[in-house]
């Protein structure tokens, strides 16, 4: 799939997206994959990490507007830190204001992504499908 | 966004996707865009054509498995031909068996795509959101 040294002329309005792992979704130079098999949050995180990715991080409603249309519930990389009562991402960054509406359906320290930028709190040990994400440089 | 003549080394497991119109979703070298504004089927078709694309064509559950997760209902390029009673795509090809479950909610000659490969029959003049698709060469 290498594009190097190809003499292909593409319109200026068209562009390549990526690079992404093979058969992942590429959107605005981020890579996403939805995994069907249900795993708990820790296993989901491990699965993403094994693919050089992380669980979904929501950082921009504009750059990630494709997430509006996602059906069902999927683990994302948002975790609750009980000691200070904060929701933060795997990378340690704090959840930015106005990005997600957190809904406490269950008591838990992990969150499921649901359409229209909602986060449902869930027990981290419950199996769910998950979304991995890889940000391109 | 041109990648030509760049000496970038990417893993063999990684690849670029496209080319696609700027800010479209790229998946398995097809380009998709979801449009929020509601239009009737004919206006939706015209909108896609103006962007050198067509309304969504479902041709493979494997290559288009991202469509499983799509929330809501959106115009696709499937139309009913009253003379012979068949459903066919804009390009004239016949709807392959076992690809879509056609559900007759309304009387009509156009179809809305809904998650899990369902097609809902609808009156073509009703406004709905729509999905454009561009197949890369």
């Amino acid at each position: 799939n290498s594009l190097f040294n190809q003499e292909v002329q593409i319109p200026l309005t068209e562009s390549y997206c990526g690079p992404c792992p093979k058969n992942w979704i590429c959107y605005k130079n981020n890579c996403y994959q939805f995994f069907n098999e249900s795993k708990n949050w820790y296993e989901s995180q491990a699965s993403c990490m094994s693919q050089n990715a992380s669980l979904l991080k929501v950082y921009s409603k504009e750059d990630q507007d494709l997430l509006k249309l996602v059906k069902s519930y999927h683990w994302m990389g948002l975790v609750h830190i009980p000691t200070n009562g904060s929701w933060q991402w795997e990378d340690g960054s704090i959840l930015s204001p106005n990005l997600l509406t957190i809904i406490e359906m269950q008591k838990g320290d992990c969150a499921l992504y649901a359409s229209s930028f909602k986060g449902y709190i869930e027990n981290c040990s419950i199996p769910n499908t998950y979304i991995c994400m890889q940000r391109t440089v | 966004n041109s990648l030509f003549n760049q000496e970038v080394q990417i893993p063999l497991t990684e690849s670029y996707c496209g080319p696609c119109p700027k800010n479209w979703i790229c998946y398995k070298n097809n380009c998709y865009q979801f449009f929020n504004e509601s239009k009737n089927w004919y206006e939706s078709q015209a909108s896609c054509m103006s962007q050198n694309a067509s309304l969504l064509k479902v041709y493979s559950k494997e290559d288009q498995d991202l469509l499983k997760l799509v929330k809501s209902y959106h115009w696709m390029g499937l139309v009913h031909i009253p003379t012979n009673g068949s459903w066919q795509w804009e390009d004239g090809s016949i709807l392959s068996p076992n690809l879509l479950t056609i559900i007759e909610m309304q009387k009509g000659d156009c179809a809305l795509y809904a998650s899990s490969f369902k097609g809902y029959i609808e009156n073509c003049s009703i406004p709905n959101t729509y999905i454009c698709m561009q197949r890369t060469v």
Epitope: H80, T83, W87, T101 | -
Partner: antibody
């Protein structure tokens, strides 16, 4: 240095309204959950309402639900409490408090000095 | 709603004494418990959070323990400035609730 400064308290008749403000400084206001806590004269502490802009949630004690509204203006780093249909039992010192994180589960890390609301005819 | 019951409600002790205040929750609250000190006419001050974590700047003579439903605040050696009212508070679920308070006075 984190500072919380309440204002807007005073004497009001039963059934009346009052709007409390809490001006803040010394931290990124929009990143933190904020609450109002009150203390009736000679009594203990009672949580009134919570708001998190970051997490997009708001909650109220049953005793004030439907009468009080919490809001914030992130551009002014200010928290508000609109109090309507006031009753004698709402008489208290009202404290503005900052949670340690962006959710109600964090402790009250900092408190203002309080503003006294007296509901009496 | 989760009720918090502090005991004792009133405590008389001397400088240098070791003092323990308990807080019992009506249901399990994991470690979502904080302790506050309040002096007359002043706002409360956070001492302990997450049941046992000492807030920055709080003297080490204060300590907290417990998990689930039973919690304790211990002052290892009372100092004159420690005479105040102490409250426990849970943030496991809303409504956030406080204990009724423990008034610590000089004997």
């Amino acid at each position: 240095e984190v500072q919380l400064l309440e204002s807007g308290g005073g004497l009001v008749q039963p059934g009346g309204s009052l709007r409390l403000s809490c001006a803040t400084s010394g931290f990124t206001f929009s990143d933190y959950a904020m609450s109002w806590v009150r203390q009736a004269p000679g009594k203990g502490l009672e949580w009134v309402s919570y708001n998190s802009f970051s997490v997009g949630s708001t909650d109220y004690a049953d005793s004030v639900k439907g009468r009080f509204t919490i809001s914030r203006d992130n551009s002014k780093n200010t928290l508000y409490l609109q109090m309507n249909s006031l009753r004698a039992e709402d008489t208290a010192v009202y404290y503005c408090s900052k949670h340690s994180g962006n959710y109600y589960t964090g402790p009250f890390h900092y408190w203002g000095q309080g503003t006294l609301v007296t509901v009496s005819s | 709603d989760i009720q918090l019951t502090q005991s004792p409600s009133f405590l008389s002790a001397s400088v240098g004494d070791r003092v323990t205040i308990t807080c019992r929750a009506s249901q399990g609250i994991s470690s979502y418990l904080a302790w506050y000190q309040q002096k007359p006419g002043k706002a409360p001050k956070l001492l302990i959070y997450a049941a046992s974590s000492l807030e920055s700047g709080v003297p080490s003579r204060f300590s907290g323990s417990g998990s689930g439903t039973d919690f304790t605040l211990t002052i290892s050696s009372l100092q004159p400035e420690d005479f105040a009212t102490y409250y426990c508070q849970q943030s496991y679920s809303t409504p956030i609730t406080f204990g009724q308070g423990t008034r610590l006075e000089i004997k």
